[in-house]
Structure formats: structure tokens, C-alpha cells
């Protein structure tokens, strides 16, 4: 039995005609099975295969090799969260967080909790103490005074 064009199988009861449109992107093998074109997958070959490494959770694509990020995610593979706008010395595990690095505080991680270590403001052998975000106090040796023991 010879099947008509695009019909396959015993009894010619399988249909496959190559297509490359909204409904699918496939060719047909000798048994009438759909064989997806490069970059496509799924039962109807209408799901794009995203860029290798594209986060399955935070990235997606409608065209092969693409990787479009969900809101709040960034990077080539959509695997990097976007921190809170204005976050200075902080990172995120989830979008819009601002988790402060060591010795930084405040909502935007812009307050120095180790002013003494960062700026070493005390002169002339003064001893520096961190007293709060962006705050410090110098204990001056005998014979020196002023906020930074500069006098």
C-alpha cells in the first residue's frame, strides 16, 4: 500500500506535513513522526529551546537561543536578582532585597558601621571607636584634642 502525500503508517492513518509557523516547527521522518527543527521542542515542536544555561525558573524564551528575564531578574542567564534600587554595599538573594555586606548597614547599605577601619580618622595615635552608622569617637593621647586628635 502506497500512502498519499503526507500520510504514513499501516492503513495510512498518520498525517505529517512539515510546517514552520505558529502551530509548530518540524519536519517528518520516514514513519510520519514530527522531528523538531533545531531550537524547538515539545509534542508539536512549538516550544523554543532557550539559551543553554538560561534559568528555568527565572528565564524563558519564545525564540530559540533567547533568554528573557522575569521581572526582578537580570544577567545573560536570568540567574542574578536585581537588588533594591539605590542599594550601595549590599546584595540580594531575591529581587529587590538589599542584604548588607559586612560593616555596612541601613536600608540601602550605605551606612558605614566600621568608620574607624574604613577611614582611620583618628590622628596622632588616637584610638578610634565605632559608635554607630557613620559615627565614631577618637580617644586622644595626652597632649592632643579635637574630634580627630588633630589639635
Amino acid at each position: 500500500v502506497t500512502c498519499d502525500d503526507y500520510y504514513y503508517g499501516f492503513g495510512c492513518n498518520k498525517f505529517c506535513r512539515p510546517r514552520d509557523d505558529f502551530f509548530g516547527h518540524y519536519a517528518c521522518d520516514q514513519n510520519g513522526n514530527k522531528t523538531c527543527m533545531e531550537g524547538w521542542m515539545g509534542p508539536e515542536c512549538n516550544r523554543a529551546i532557550c539559551r543553554q544555561g538560561c534559568s528555568p525558573k527565572h528565564g524563558s524564551c519564545k525564540l530559540p537561543g533567547d533568554c528573557r528575564c522575569q521581572y526582578g531578574w537580570q544577567g545573560l542567564y536570568c540567574d542574578k536578582c536585581i537588588p533594591h534600587p539605590g542599594c550601595v554595599h549590599g546584595i540580594c538573594n531575591e529581587p529587590w532585597q538589599c542584604l548588607c555586606e559586612t560593616n555596612w548597614g541601613g536600608q540601602l547599605c550605605d551606612k558605614d558601621l566600621n568608620y574607624c577601619g574604613t577611614h582611620q580618622p583618628c590622628l596622632n595615635g588616637g584610638t578610634c571607636s565605632n559608635t554607630g552608622p557613620d559615627k565614631y569617637q577618637c580617644s586622644c593621647p595626652e597632649g592632643y584634642s579635637g574630634p580627630n586628635c588633630e589639635i
Epitope: D4, Y6, Y7, C12, F15, R17, D21, F22, F23, G24, G42, P43, E44, N46, R47, K62
Partner: antibody, heavy 116, light 107 residues
Framework: QVQLVQSGAELKKPGASVKVSCKVS????????IHWVRQAPGQGLEWMGI????????KYAQKFQGRVTMTVDTSTSTAYMELSSLRSEDTAVYYC?????????WGQGTLVTVSS | DIQMTQSPSSLSASVGDRVTITCRTS??????LTWYQQKPGKAPKLLVY???ILAAGVPSRFSGSGSGTDFTLTISSLQPEDFATYYC?????????FGGGTKLEIK
């Protein structure tokens, strides 16, 4: 087994909107497109549009462009069809259907009546 | 849009008769054609897809043929349960239009 279960009958006033749901079970929801078809009383079948359930992309018949919106909620395996600016001629049974090579599975239909 | 012309629009026949319904399209749709049967108050039922493939569970007295622009649904020996309305539909490109229907009645 494959099932498409639609929401109940609706009575709407002209100018209003209606949103019909189609809850799917028995297969992977995002593997198959959902189509919407309507049938006015005593009339034939009219194809309204298709939605790709994986991406949420939809294509509509020209006649309904601008008035119809098809959406999906993959978390509940439900497709929705919303028709706005209703008029009396929109009185019909609205069906959802699954398929690529024709519609092997249909919802039971939702009667939408538009009357003042 | 592809136009679907289905004929006849109505048909009277008797149990045991051989019945043919035709569907003509305004352009080549290859074999992207489907036939449905619908009974009052029910959703349509798929009979034949891709012009000539019988859907699962459909009796062998139903058959489809044709390709390109001319298609036929044949019922070789009408049974009482076959009296219904029949529709063709193409699924080649958007929109997937239906034919106007053929109402098959008992003579």
C-alpha cells in the same frame, strides 16, 4: 481521562463583559493549545481564537479583534475567554476545545445570554 | 481568510442510504480538514481529521476523502443515530473557519 469543564451560564446586559473559564484535567495543560468556538441559537459553529497555553500567546478571528481576550492560568490549568462590549448578537453557547489536528475534546459549553 | 463552502445545507435520507457531504475551500489547504457531527444541545464530536483519518471510536461507515480544495464525508449506510448536523473545518491557517453545516434529516 481528558476533561474540559466550563463555568456556568451567564446573563449579561448589553455593553457589559463576560469571562468564561475552562478548567482542564487529564493531560499536561501546556502541551496543547486551547481554542474557543461559539454557536448562536440555531446557527453554525464560529471559531473565535486560539491560545498557546505554554506562552500565553493568542490569535483571534478578525471579527472579535479588540473585543476578546484569551488568557491562561497554568497553576490551575484553566483557560479564560473574556468578551467585552456585549450585544444581543453575542447570545450563544461558548465552547473551549483542545487540539491541533481538529478538536477531539470539547468543554460542555457555556450559555451566555445578552439581554436588557 | 479561507472560505468554506459546505453542501448541501440540508439533506433528507433513509436508514441504510449512502450519503455524501462535500466541503470546498477557497484555497489549497492540503489535508488540514476536519469533520464533526453535532446533535442538539451537545458539543460537536470529532469524526475525521486530516481529511481522511477516522477519529478513535468512530464507526467505519464514516469515511473522509479529498485534499487541496475539495473534500467529502461519506456515510456508507445510514444508521438512526447518524441523523445530526455535520460541519467541516479547516486547520491550515488562522482563522480556522467552519463550513455552514449540513443538517441530515430522516426522510
Amino acid at each position: 481521562q481528558v476533561q474540559l469543564v466550563q463555568s456556568g451560564a451567564e446573563l449579561k446586559k448589553p455593553g457589559a463583559s463576560v469571562k468564561v473559564s475552562c478548567k482542564v484535567s487529564g493531560y499536561a495543560f501546556t502541551d496543547y493549545a486551547i481554542h474557543w468556538v461559539r454557536q448562536a441559537p440555531g446557527q453554525g459553529l464560529e471559531w473565535m481564537g486560539i491560545i498557546n497555553t505554554y506562552y500565553g500567546d493568542s490569535k483571534y478571528a478578525q471579527k472579535f479583534q479588540g473585543r476578546v481576550t484569551m488568557t491562561v492560568d497554568t497553576s490551575t490549568s484553566t483557560a479564560y475567554m473574556e468578551l467585552s462590549s456585549l450585544r444581543s448578537e453575542d447570545t450563544a453557547v461558548y465552547y473551549c476545545a483542545r487540539g491541533y489536528d481538529g478538536f477531539a475534546y470539547w468543554g460542555q459549553g457555556t450559555l451566555v445570554t445578552v439581554s436588557s | 481568510d479561507i472560505q468554506m463552502t459546505q453542501s448541501p445545507s440540508s439533506l433528507s435520507a433513509s436508514v441504510g442510504d449512502r450519503v455524501t457531504i462535500t466541503c470546498r475551500t477557497s484555497e489549497n489547504i492540503y489535508s488540514y480538514l476536519t469533520w464533526y457531527q453535532q446533535k442538539p444541545g451537545k458539543a460537536p464530536k470529532l469524526l475525521v481529521y486530516n481529511a481522511k483519518i477516522l477519529a478513535a471510536g468512530v464507526p467505519s461507515r464514516f469515511s473522509g476523502s479529498g485534499s487541496g480544495t475539495d473534500f467529502t464525508l461519506t456515510i456508507s449506510s445510514l444508521q438512526p443515530e447518524d441523523f445530526a448536523t455535520y460541519y467541516c473545518q479547516h486547520h491550515y491557517d488562522i482563522p480556522w473557519t467552519f463550513g455552514g453545516g449540513t443538517k441530515l434529516e430522516i426522510k
